[in-house]
C-alpha cells in the first residue's frame, strides 16, 4: 500500500514528518488528509524520464 506524502511541521520546516498510512500531504492547506480526497492517482510512466511505480521505500511527495 502506498504511504502518504510527507506533511510539514510548519511552512518553513526543513524536515517534513510523514503522514500516517492512507493519508497524503495536501499542498494547498499544508496538512495531511485522506488520499482519496486529493485525486492522487499513481503516475503512469511515459518513458525513461518518468518515475518507476512507487514502493513503500520511495520518498513521497
Amino acid at each position: 500500500m502506498r504511504r502518504g506524502p510527507r506533511s510539514l511541521r510548519g511552512r518553513d520546516a526543513p524536515a517534513p514528518t510523514p503522514c500516517v498510512p492512507a493519508e497524503c500531504f495536501d499542498l494547498l492547506v499544508r496538512h495531511c488528509v485522506a488520499c482519496g480526497l486529493l485525486r492522487a492517482p499513481r503516475p503512469k510512466p511515459a518513458g525513461a524520464s518518468s518515475p518507476a511505480p512507487r514502493t513503500a521505500l520511495q520518498p513521497q511527495e
Epitope: 506524502p5 495536501d26 488520499c35 480526497l37 486529493l38 485525486r39 492522487a40 492517482p41 511527495e61
Partner: antibody, heavy 118, light 113 residues
Framework: DVQLQESGPSLVKPSQTLSLTCSVT????????WNWIRKFPGNKLEYMGY???????YYNPSLKSRISITRDTSKNQFYLQLLSVTTEDTATYYC????????????WGAGTLVTVSS | DIVMTQTPLSLPVSLGDQASISCRSS???????????LHWYLQKPGQSPKLLIY???NRFSGVPDRFSGSGSGTDFTLKISRVEAEDLGVYFC??????????FGSGTKLEIK
C-alpha cells in the same frame, strides 16, 4: 476518463455579472480541487481560484471581491461568478482539475470565450 | 506571488531543428518537502492546454521522448530535440510550489520559420 465542459453566455455587457458552469463527468467534485483559469488575448494565463473537496474556496487577490466559486455536488457541477465585468475580462475561461500527487492541472475543459462588450 | 519569466516569447524554428525554451522563477521552486513543482504545458491552436512535463523532468503519459525538461532552483529549460509540425503551439511553464495562487509563464509561441 474525466471530462470537463464549460457553459455559459459568450457575450456579457460591462458592469454585468459573468456566470459560467463547469460540468464534470468521470469523477466526483467531492474529491480534489476544481479550478478556474482564464487566458487573455495575447496568451497570458491567469489563475482565478478553486473550490475544494470540502467546499472551501480560494480566490486570486488580483480579482479582489468580484469573484465567487460555488458548487452543486448533486449535479457534479461547479460555477464561476465574476461581478462588475469590464472589457478587460474578455478572455477564454477554462475549468480544470488538479492532480493531488504532483499538483499539476491534469484535466481541462475545452474553454469558452467570453467577450465583454456593450 | 511567484513571477514566472519565459523566454523567448516567440520561437521560429525549422522542422527537425532543436528548440529550447527557458523559464525563470522569482523564487526557488524547491518545496520544503524536497520536491520541485515546475511543470510545462502545451496549448495547440484551438485546444486547451495539455500537460507535457511535470516536476521539472518527468514526461507525462503519451508525451514523445523528444521532449525533455531540466533545471533546478529558479532556472528551468524545456527542449524539443527534433521539432515536428504537431509540436507547434504555445508552451507555458507553471509552478505549484508556492501556492495558491498557481502561476504561469507568459508563454512561448513555437512557429515555423
Amino acid at each position: 476518463d474525466v471530462q470537463l465542459q464549460e457553459s455559459g453566455p459568450s457575450l456579457v455587457k460591462p458592469s454585468q455579472t459573468l456566470s459560467l458552469t463547469c460540468s464534470v463527468t468521470g469523477d466526483s467534485i467531492t474529491s480534489g480541487y476544481w479550478n478556474w483559469i482564464r487566458k487573455f488575448p495575447g496568451n497570458k494565463l491567469e489563475y482565478m481560484g478553486y473550490i475544494s473537496y470540502s467546499g472551501s474556496t480560494y480566490y486570486n487577490p488580483s480579482l479582489k471581491s468580484r469573484i465567487s466559486i460555488t458548487r452543486d455536488t448533486s449535479k457534479n457541477q461547479f460555477y464561476l461568478q465574476l461581478l462588475s465585468v469590464t472589457t478587460e475580462d474578455t478572455a477564454t475561461y477554462y475549468c480544470a482539475g488538479l492532480d493531488g500527487l504532483y499538483w499539476y492541472f491534469d484535466v481541462w475543459g475545452a474553454g469558452t470565450l467570453v467577450t465583454v462588450s456593450s | 506571488d511567484i513571477v514566472m519569466t519565459q523566454t523567448p516569447l516567440s520561437l521560429p524554428v525549422s522542422l527537425g531543428d532543436q528548440a529550447s525554451i527557458s523559464c525563470r522563477s522569482s523564487q526557488s521552486l524547491v518545496h520544503s518537502n524536497g520536491n520541485t513543482y515546475l511543470h510545462w504545458y502545451l496549448q495547440k491552436p484551438g485546444q486547451s492546454p495539455k500537460l507535457l512535463i511535470y516536476k521539472v523532468s518527468n514526461r507525462f503519459s503519451g508525451v514523445p521522448d523528444r521532449f525533455s525538461g531540466s533545471g533546478s532552483g529558479t532556472d528551468f529549460t524545456l527542449k524539443i530535440s527534433r521539432v515536428e509540425a504537431e509540436d507547434l503551439g504555445v508552451y507555458f511553464c507553471s509552478q505549484s510550489t508556492h501556492v495558491p495562487p498557481f502561476t504561469f509563464g507568459s508563454g512561448t509561441k513555437l512557429e515555423i520559420k
